[in-house]
Interface confidence: low
Amino acid sequence: HTDLSGKVFVFPRESVTDHVNLITQLEKPLQNFTLCFRAYTDLSRPYSLFSYNTQGKDNELVVYKERVGDYSLYIGRQKVTFKVIEKFPAPVHICVSWESSSGIAEFWINGTPLVKKGLRQGYSVEAHPKIVLGQEQDSYGGKFDKSQSFVGEIGDLYMWNSVLPPEEILSAYQGTPVPANILDWRALNYEIKGYVIIKPLVWV
Protein backbone atom coordinates (compact mmCIF):
# COMPACT_ATOMS: atom_id res chain seq x y z
CA HIS A 1 0.00 0.00 0.00
CA THR A 2 1.34 3.38 -1.01
CA ASP A 3 0.60 6.88 0.17
CA LEU A 4 0.03 8.85 -3.02
CA SER A 5 -0.69 12.17 -1.32
CA GLY A 6 0.31 15.02 -3.60
CA LYS A 7 0.70 12.71 -6.59
CA VAL A 8 -1.35 11.73 -9.64
CA PHE A 9 -1.50 8.95 -12.17
CA VAL A 10 -0.65 10.41 -15.57
CA PHE A 11 -2.11 8.62 -18.58
CA PRO A 12 -0.05 10.32 -21.31
CA ARG A 13 -1.51 8.76 -24.47
CA GLU A 14 -4.58 7.25 -26.04
CA SER A 15 -4.27 3.46 -25.92
CA VAL A 16 -6.04 0.17 -25.49
CA THR A 17 -3.48 -1.06 -22.97
CA ASP A 18 -2.50 1.63 -20.46
CA HIS A 19 -4.41 1.43 -17.19
CA VAL A 20 -4.19 1.14 -13.42
CA ASN A 21 -5.83 -1.68 -11.47
CA LEU A 22 -7.01 -0.59 -8.03
CA ILE A 23 -6.94 -3.49 -5.62
CA THR A 24 -9.39 -3.75 -2.75
CA GLN A 25 -10.62 -6.50 -0.45
CA LEU A 26 -14.28 -5.63 -0.90
CA GLU A 27 -15.98 -8.77 0.35
CA LYS A 28 -19.60 -7.75 0.78
CA PRO A 29 -22.04 -6.09 -1.64
CA LEU A 30 -22.31 -2.31 -1.58
CA GLN A 31 -25.65 -0.77 -0.73
CA ASN A 32 -24.19 2.69 -0.33
CA PHE A 33 -21.03 4.32 -1.54
CA THR A 34 -19.29 7.60 -2.16
CA LEU A 35 -16.46 7.95 -4.65
CA CYS A 36 -14.34 11.10 -4.94
CA PHE A 37 -11.39 11.93 -7.16
CA ARG A 38 -9.67 14.71 -9.11
CA ALA A 39 -9.18 14.61 -12.88
CA TYR A 40 -7.60 16.83 -15.50
CA THR A 41 -7.92 16.14 -19.21
CA ASP A 42 -8.34 17.97 -22.49
CA LEU A 43 -10.32 15.15 -24.12
CA SER A 44 -13.58 16.22 -25.72
CA ARG A 45 -14.64 12.72 -26.77
CA PRO A 46 -16.36 10.28 -24.37
CA TYR A 47 -14.13 8.49 -21.85
CA SER A 48 -14.25 6.35 -18.72
CA LEU A 49 -13.14 7.88 -15.43
CA PHE A 50 -13.77 4.93 -13.11
CA SER A 51 -14.67 1.39 -14.14
CA TYR A 52 -15.83 -1.23 -11.60
CA ASN A 53 -16.83 -4.63 -12.97
CA THR A 54 -17.61 -7.90 -11.24
CA GLN A 55 -17.46 -11.45 -12.51
CA GLY A 56 -19.89 -11.71 -15.40
CA LYS A 57 -21.27 -8.20 -14.83
CA ASP A 58 -20.25 -5.34 -17.08
CA ASN A 59 -20.86 -1.71 -16.03
CA GLU A 60 -21.57 -2.62 -12.42
CA LEU A 61 -20.35 0.82 -11.32
CA VAL A 62 -18.97 3.23 -13.89
CA VAL A 63 -18.31 6.97 -13.91
CA TYR A 64 -18.25 8.07 -17.53
CA LYS A 65 -17.85 11.43 -19.26
CA GLU A 66 -20.16 11.59 -22.27
CA ARG A 67 -19.16 15.06 -23.43
CA VAL A 68 -18.29 18.46 -21.94
CA GLY A 69 -20.95 19.15 -19.32
CA ASP A 70 -22.39 15.61 -19.21
CA TYR A 71 -21.33 13.00 -16.65
CA SER A 72 -22.93 9.56 -16.44
CA LEU A 73 -23.15 7.07 -13.61
CA TYR A 74 -23.86 3.42 -14.28
CA ILE A 75 -25.10 1.17 -11.49
CA GLY A 76 -25.83 -2.42 -12.46
CA ARG A 77 -25.83 -1.48 -16.16
CA GLN A 78 -28.44 1.27 -15.71
CA LYS A 79 -27.42 4.84 -16.43
CA VAL A 80 -28.25 8.34 -15.25
CA THR A 81 -26.68 11.50 -16.64
CA PHE A 82 -25.83 14.67 -14.75
CA LYS A 83 -25.50 18.04 -16.45
CA VAL A 84 -23.17 20.82 -15.39
CA ILE A 85 -21.86 24.03 -16.91
CA GLU A 86 -18.10 23.69 -16.86
CA LYS A 87 -14.97 25.26 -18.25
CA PHE A 88 -12.99 23.20 -20.72
CA PRO A 89 -10.31 22.12 -20.29
CA ALA A 90 -10.09 22.54 -16.52
CA PRO A 91 -9.22 20.44 -13.47
CA VAL A 92 -12.26 18.95 -11.77
CA HIS A 93 -13.03 17.39 -8.41
CA ILE A 94 -15.79 14.81 -8.72
CA CYS A 95 -17.76 13.09 -5.98
CA VAL A 96 -20.55 10.66 -6.69
CA SER A 97 -22.68 8.84 -4.14
CA TRP A 98 -25.49 6.33 -4.35
CA GLU A 99 -27.89 4.96 -1.76
CA SER A 100 -29.61 1.67 -2.50
CA SER A 101 -32.60 2.17 -0.20
CA SER A 102 -33.75 5.29 -2.06
CA GLY A 103 -31.92 4.78 -5.35
CA ILE A 104 -30.77 8.39 -5.12
CA ALA A 105 -27.50 9.24 -6.85
CA GLU A 106 -25.70 12.50 -6.18
CA PHE A 107 -22.97 14.11 -8.23
CA TRP A 108 -20.79 16.91 -6.88
CA ILE A 109 -18.50 18.91 -9.14
CA ASN A 110 -15.88 21.09 -7.41
CA GLY A 111 -17.85 21.01 -4.17
CA THR A 112 -21.17 21.93 -5.81
CA PRO A 113 -24.07 19.44 -5.92
CA LEU A 114 -25.79 18.74 -9.23
CA VAL A 115 -29.47 17.82 -9.56
CA LYS A 116 -30.06 14.46 -7.88
CA LYS A 117 -31.10 11.45 -9.98
CA GLY A 118 -32.47 8.04 -9.13
CA LEU A 119 -31.60 4.55 -10.30
CA ARG A 120 -31.51 0.94 -9.20
CA GLN A 121 -33.47 1.36 -5.97
CA GLY A 122 -32.97 -1.72 -3.78
CA TYR A 123 -30.03 -2.99 -5.81
CA SER A 124 -26.69 -4.12 -4.32
CA VAL A 125 -23.45 -3.47 -6.16
CA GLU A 126 -21.62 -6.78 -6.27
CA ALA A 127 -18.41 -7.39 -4.30
CA HIS A 128 -15.04 -8.73 -5.50
CA PRO A 129 -14.62 -6.12 -8.24
CA LYS A 130 -11.96 -5.38 -10.79
CA ILE A 131 -11.49 -1.61 -10.60
CA VAL A 132 -9.73 0.10 -13.50
CA LEU A 133 -8.60 3.66 -14.13
CA GLY A 134 -7.70 4.73 -17.66
CA GLN A 135 -9.86 2.27 -19.56
CA GLU A 136 -13.49 1.14 -19.71
CA GLN A 137 -13.85 -2.59 -19.00
CA ASP A 138 -16.19 -4.61 -21.16
CA SER A 139 -15.32 -7.77 -19.28
CA TYR A 140 -13.97 -8.65 -15.85
CA GLY A 141 -10.68 -6.71 -15.87
CA GLY A 142 -10.30 -6.46 -19.64
CA LYS A 143 -11.74 -5.94 -23.13
CA PHE A 144 -10.74 -2.31 -23.41
CA ASP A 145 -11.74 0.14 -26.13
CA LYS A 146 -9.24 2.80 -27.24
CA SER A 147 -12.06 5.23 -28.04
CA GLN A 148 -13.16 5.21 -24.38
CA SER A 149 -9.69 5.42 -22.85
CA PHE A 150 -8.73 8.26 -20.53
CA VAL A 151 -5.86 10.58 -21.38
CA GLY A 152 -4.87 12.98 -18.62
CA GLU A 153 -4.30 12.93 -14.86
CA ILE A 154 -6.22 11.38 -11.96
CA GLY A 155 -5.52 11.76 -8.25
CA ASP A 156 -6.94 12.04 -4.72
CA LEU A 157 -9.20 9.04 -5.22
CA TYR A 158 -11.22 7.84 -2.24
CA MET A 159 -14.14 5.46 -1.94
CA TRP A 160 -16.33 4.89 1.11
CA ASN A 161 -19.02 2.32 1.82
CA SER A 162 -21.44 5.04 2.89
CA VAL A 163 -23.08 8.17 1.55
CA LEU A 164 -20.98 11.04 2.84
CA PRO A 165 -22.81 14.09 4.19
CA PRO A 166 -22.24 17.41 2.39
CA GLU A 167 -19.65 18.65 4.89
CA GLU A 168 -17.50 15.56 4.25
CA ILE A 169 -17.83 15.95 0.47
CA LEU A 170 -16.55 19.50 0.95
CA SER A 171 -13.71 18.21 3.13
CA ALA A 172 -12.67 15.88 0.32
CA TYR A 173 -12.86 18.73 -2.19
CA GLN A 174 -10.70 20.86 0.12
CA GLY A 175 -8.11 18.09 0.36
CA THR A 176 -8.87 16.82 3.87
CA PRO A 177 -11.03 13.72 3.33
CA VAL A 178 -12.22 11.58 6.21
CA PRO A 179 -10.66 8.08 6.23
CA ALA A 180 -11.90 5.94 3.36
CA ASN A 181 -12.44 2.24 3.79
CA ILE A 182 -12.75 0.91 0.24
CA LEU A 183 -10.08 2.91 -1.58
CA ASP A 184 -7.84 5.48 0.06
CA TRP A 185 -5.30 7.53 -1.91
CA ARG A 186 -3.14 7.71 1.22
CA ALA A 187 -2.88 3.92 1.42
CA LEU A 188 -3.55 2.64 -2.07
CA ASN A 189 -2.96 -0.85 -3.38
CA TYR A 190 -2.59 -0.56 -7.14
CA GLU A 191 -0.96 -2.10 -10.18
CA ILE A 192 0.22 -0.06 -13.18
CA LYS A 193 -0.17 -1.70 -16.56
CA GLY A 194 1.44 -0.07 -19.59
CA TYR A 195 2.45 3.55 -19.97
CA VAL A 196 1.17 5.24 -16.79
CA ILE A 197 3.46 7.50 -14.78
CA ILE A 198 3.18 8.81 -11.22
CA LYS A 199 3.93 12.54 -11.05
CA PRO A 200 3.40 15.37 -8.55
CA LEU A 201 -0.04 16.96 -8.48
CA VAL A 202 0.53 20.52 -9.68
CA TRP A 203 -2.93 21.74 -10.71
CA VAL A 204 -4.75 22.11 -7.39
Epitope: H1, G6, P165
Partner: antibody, heavy 119, light 107 residues
Protein backbone atom coordinates in the same frame (compact mmCIF):
# COMPACT_ATOMS: atom_id res chain seq x y z
CA UNK B 1 5.69 -12.88 12.90
CA UNK B 2 4.46 -9.29 12.78
CA UNK B 3 5.74 -7.42 15.83
CA UNK B 4 6.05 -3.91 17.21
CA UNK B 5 8.65 -3.57 19.97
CA UNK B 6 8.74 -0.32 21.93
CA UNK B 7 11.46 1.33 23.98
CA UNK B 8 11.58 1.06 27.76
CA UNK B 9 9.90 3.09 30.50
CA UNK B 10 10.93 6.71 31.01
CA UNK B 11 10.77 9.12 33.94
CA UNK B 12 10.77 12.77 32.92
CA UNK B 13 10.62 16.19 34.56
CA UNK B 14 7.77 18.60 33.78
CA UNK B 15 8.66 20.84 30.83
CA UNK B 16 11.05 18.30 29.28
CA UNK B 17 10.53 16.06 26.23
CA UNK B 18 10.35 12.32 25.69
CA UNK B 19 10.95 10.29 22.54
CA UNK B 20 9.44 6.81 22.37
CA UNK B 21 10.53 4.35 19.69
CA UNK B 22 8.64 1.51 18.03
CA UNK B 23 10.57 -1.04 15.97
CA UNK B 24 8.56 -2.97 13.40
CA UNK B 25 9.39 -6.43 12.11
CA UNK B 26 7.73 -9.22 10.14
CA UNK B 27 6.09 -6.97 7.53
CA UNK B 28 6.86 -4.21 5.04
CA UNK B 29 7.21 -1.21 7.33
CA UNK B 30 6.70 1.39 4.58
CA UNK B 31 3.33 -0.01 3.50
CA UNK B 32 1.27 0.59 6.63
CA UNK B 33 0.19 3.63 8.58
CA UNK B 34 1.58 3.72 12.11
CA UNK B 35 -0.58 5.24 14.83
CA UNK B 36 0.15 6.34 18.36
CA UNK B 37 -2.32 5.97 21.22
CA UNK B 38 -1.92 6.72 24.90
CA UNK B 39 -3.59 5.51 28.07
CA UNK B 40 -3.35 7.37 31.37
CA UNK B 41 -3.33 5.18 34.50
CA UNK B 42 -6.78 3.64 35.00
CA UNK B 43 -8.14 5.60 32.05
CA UNK B 44 -9.27 4.96 28.49
CA UNK B 45 -7.46 5.17 25.17
CA UNK B 46 -6.63 8.44 23.41
CA UNK B 47 -5.47 8.73 19.79
CA UNK B 48 -2.42 10.98 19.28
CA UNK B 49 -1.84 10.76 15.53
CA UNK B 50 -0.53 8.71 12.64
CA UNK B 51 2.30 8.64 10.12
CA UNK B 52 2.81 6.85 6.83
CA UNK B 53 6.44 5.66 6.77
CA UNK B 54 6.72 5.78 2.98
CA UNK B 55 5.74 9.42 2.44
CA UNK B 56 6.11 10.61 6.03
CA UNK B 57 2.62 12.06 5.66
CA UNK B 58 1.14 12.73 9.13
CA UNK B 59 -2.18 13.47 10.74
CA UNK B 60 -2.43 14.63 14.36
CA UNK B 61 -5.14 14.89 16.93
CA UNK B 62 -5.58 18.67 17.29
CA UNK B 63 -5.06 18.26 21.05
CA UNK B 64 -1.47 17.10 20.49
CA UNK B 65 -0.58 18.98 17.32
CA UNK B 66 1.62 21.58 18.99
CA UNK B 67 3.51 19.12 21.21
CA UNK B 68 3.69 15.76 19.43
CA UNK B 69 6.04 14.99 16.55
CA UNK B 70 5.85 11.69 14.68
CA UNK B 71 8.85 10.56 12.66
CA UNK B 72 10.22 7.36 11.13
CA UNK B 73 13.56 5.87 10.24
CA UNK B 74 12.93 3.67 7.21
CA UNK B 75 16.42 2.15 7.34
CA UNK B 76 15.69 0.57 10.74
CA UNK B 77 11.90 0.19 10.34
CA UNK B 78 11.40 2.31 13.44
CA UNK B 79 8.70 4.86 14.23
CA UNK B 80 9.14 7.57 16.86
CA UNK B 81 6.79 9.71 18.88
CA UNK B 82 8.23 12.75 20.61
CA UNK B 83 6.15 14.70 23.11
CA UNK B 84 7.44 18.04 24.35
CA UNK B 85 6.55 20.42 27.21
CA UNK B 86 5.61 17.49 29.39
CA UNK B 87 3.22 17.92 32.29
CA UNK B 88 2.03 15.53 34.97
CA UNK B 89 -1.15 14.70 33.05
CA UNK B 90 1.03 13.25 30.25
CA UNK B 91 1.87 10.35 32.55
CA UNK B 92 0.56 7.41 30.56
CA UNK B 93 1.38 4.26 28.68
CA UNK B 94 2.12 5.16 25.05
CA UNK B 95 1.37 2.58 22.36
CA UNK B 96 2.27 2.38 18.72
CA UNK B 97 -0.24 0.49 16.61
CA UNK B 98 -0.29 -0.55 12.97
CA UNK B 99 -3.33 0.29 10.89
CA UNK B 100 -4.80 -2.67 9.04
CA UNK B 101 -4.00 -2.56 5.34
CA UNK B 102 -7.64 -2.14 4.31
CA UNK B 103 -9.89 -1.15 7.17
CA UNK B 104 -9.23 1.70 9.58
CA UNK B 105 -8.55 -0.25 12.73
CA UNK B 106 -5.40 -1.29 14.57
CA UNK B 107 -4.46 -4.90 14.04
CA UNK B 108 -1.02 -4.97 15.70
CA UNK B 109 0.01 -3.09 18.84
CA UNK B 110 3.31 -2.51 20.57
CA UNK B 111 3.66 -3.63 24.19
CA UNK B 112 3.46 -0.03 25.43
CA UNK B 113 5.93 2.39 27.01
CA UNK B 114 5.20 3.91 30.41
CA UNK B 115 6.16 7.58 30.56
CA UNK B 116 6.05 9.07 34.05
CA UNK B 117 6.20 12.84 34.41
CA UNK B 118 7.16 13.87 37.90
CA UNK B 119 9.18 16.57 39.55
CA UNK C 1 -14.68 15.46 18.08
CA UNK C 2 -17.01 12.47 17.99
CA UNK C 3 -17.87 11.15 21.45
CA UNK C 4 -18.19 7.39 21.87
CA UNK C 5 -20.28 6.56 24.92
CA UNK C 6 -20.06 3.00 26.16
CA UNK C 7 -22.48 1.33 28.52
CA UNK C 8 -22.33 -0.10 31.02
CA UNK C 9 -19.01 1.14 32.37
CA UNK C 10 -18.67 -2.06 34.38
CA UNK C 11 -20.47 -5.36 34.34
CA UNK C 12 -20.43 -8.46 36.54
CA UNK C 13 -21.25 -11.75 34.87
CA UNK C 14 -20.66 -15.49 35.18
CA UNK C 15 -19.02 -18.00 32.89
CA UNK C 16 -21.57 -19.09 30.29
CA UNK C 17 -23.55 -15.84 30.42
CA UNK C 18 -24.50 -13.87 27.34
CA UNK C 19 -23.19 -10.33 27.61
CA UNK C 20 -23.94 -7.23 25.53
CA UNK C 21 -21.96 -3.99 25.56
CA UNK C 22 -23.26 -0.96 23.69
CA UNK C 23 -21.51 2.03 22.20
CA UNK C 24 -23.26 5.19 21.06
CA UNK C 25 -21.59 7.70 18.77
CA UNK C 26 -22.42 11.41 19.05
CA UNK C 27 -22.87 11.53 15.26
CA UNK C 28 -23.09 9.12 12.34
CA UNK C 29 -19.95 7.00 11.94
CA UNK C 30 -21.43 4.61 9.36
CA UNK C 31 -20.03 1.13 10.03
CA UNK C 32 -16.56 2.39 10.87
CA UNK C 33 -16.33 1.05 14.40
CA UNK C 34 -13.85 -1.39 15.91
CA UNK C 35 -13.91 -3.22 19.26
CA UNK C 36 -10.83 -4.06 21.31
CA UNK C 37 -10.20 -6.24 24.36
CA UNK C 38 -7.59 -5.21 26.91
CA UNK C 39 -6.29 -7.15 29.89
CA UNK C 40 -4.40 -5.49 32.78
CA UNK C 41 -0.85 -4.52 31.85
CA UNK C 42 -1.31 -5.54 28.23
CA UNK C 43 -1.93 -3.74 24.94
CA UNK C 44 -5.42 -3.82 23.44
CA UNK C 45 -6.25 -6.58 20.96
CA UNK C 46 -8.54 -6.20 17.96
CA UNK C 47 -11.78 -8.19 18.16
CA UNK C 48 -14.20 -6.66 15.66
CA UNK C 49 -13.71 -4.25 12.77
CA UNK C 50 -16.11 -2.50 10.41
CA UNK C 51 -18.80 -2.96 13.10
CA UNK C 52 -19.44 -6.64 12.46
CA UNK C 53 -16.36 -8.45 11.13
CA UNK C 54 -14.38 -10.68 13.48
CA UNK C 55 -10.62 -10.23 13.40
CA UNK C 56 -8.74 -13.39 12.43
CA UNK C 57 -8.36 -15.81 15.32
CA UNK C 58 -11.15 -14.23 17.38
CA UNK C 59 -13.59 -16.88 18.68
CA UNK C 60 -17.06 -16.98 17.13
CA UNK C 61 -18.70 -16.22 20.48
CA UNK C 62 -17.73 -12.57 19.86
CA UNK C 63 -20.00 -10.69 17.48
CA UNK C 64 -20.58 -7.07 16.59
CA UNK C 65 -23.49 -5.25 15.04
CA UNK C 66 -24.81 -1.77 14.32
CA UNK C 67 -24.30 1.16 11.99
CA UNK C 68 -24.82 4.89 12.12
CA UNK C 69 -24.68 5.81 15.80
CA UNK C 70 -25.56 2.62 17.73
CA UNK C 71 -23.23 -0.34 18.04
CA UNK C 72 -23.20 -3.55 20.06
CA UNK C 73 -20.58 -6.09 21.08
CA UNK C 74 -22.02 -9.42 22.17
CA UNK C 75 -20.27 -12.34 23.84
CA UNK C 76 -22.63 -15.28 23.46
CA UNK C 77 -21.20 -17.50 26.20
CA UNK C 78 -18.60 -16.01 28.51
CA UNK C 79 -15.37 -17.91 29.00
CA UNK C 80 -12.92 -17.32 31.87
CA UNK C 81 -10.43 -15.63 29.51
CA UNK C 82 -13.04 -13.06 28.43
CA UNK C 83 -12.93 -11.11 31.68
CA UNK C 84 -11.22 -7.89 30.59
CA UNK C 85 -11.94 -4.30 29.58
CA UNK C 86 -13.57 -3.67 26.20
CA UNK C 87 -13.29 -0.50 24.12
CA UNK C 88 -15.12 0.68 21.05
CA UNK C 89 -13.39 3.02 18.59
CA UNK C 90 -14.72 5.10 15.73
CA UNK C 91 -12.51 5.46 12.68
CA UNK C 92 -14.89 7.49 10.53
CA UNK C 93 -13.55 10.95 11.38
CA UNK C 94 -10.37 12.52 12.68
CA UNK C 95 -9.48 12.44 15.45
CA UNK C 96 -10.18 8.76 15.99
CA UNK C 97 -11.89 8.39 19.35
CA UNK C 98 -12.51 5.56 21.79
CA UNK C 99 -15.26 4.78 24.24
CA UNK C 100 -14.37 5.07 27.90
CA UNK C 101 -14.30 1.28 28.29
CA UNK C 102 -16.45 -1.44 29.84
CA UNK C 103 -14.86 -3.53 32.56
CA UNK C 104 -16.20 -7.07 32.56
CA UNK C 105 -15.73 -8.76 35.94
CA UNK C 106 -16.48 -12.19 37.34
CA UNK C 107 -19.65 -12.28 39.43
Amino acid sequence: QVQLVQSGAEVKKPGSSVKVSCKASGYTFTSYWMHWVRQAPGQGLEWIGMIHPNSVNTNYNEKFKSRATLTVDKSTSTAYMELSSLRSEDTAVYYCARRNDYYWYFDVWGQGTLVTVSS
Amino acid sequence: DIQMTQSPSSLSASVGDRVTITCKASQNVNSNVAWYQQKPGKAPKALIYSASYRYSGVPSRFSGSGSGTDFTLTISSLQPEDFATYYCQQCNNYPFTFGQGTKLEIK
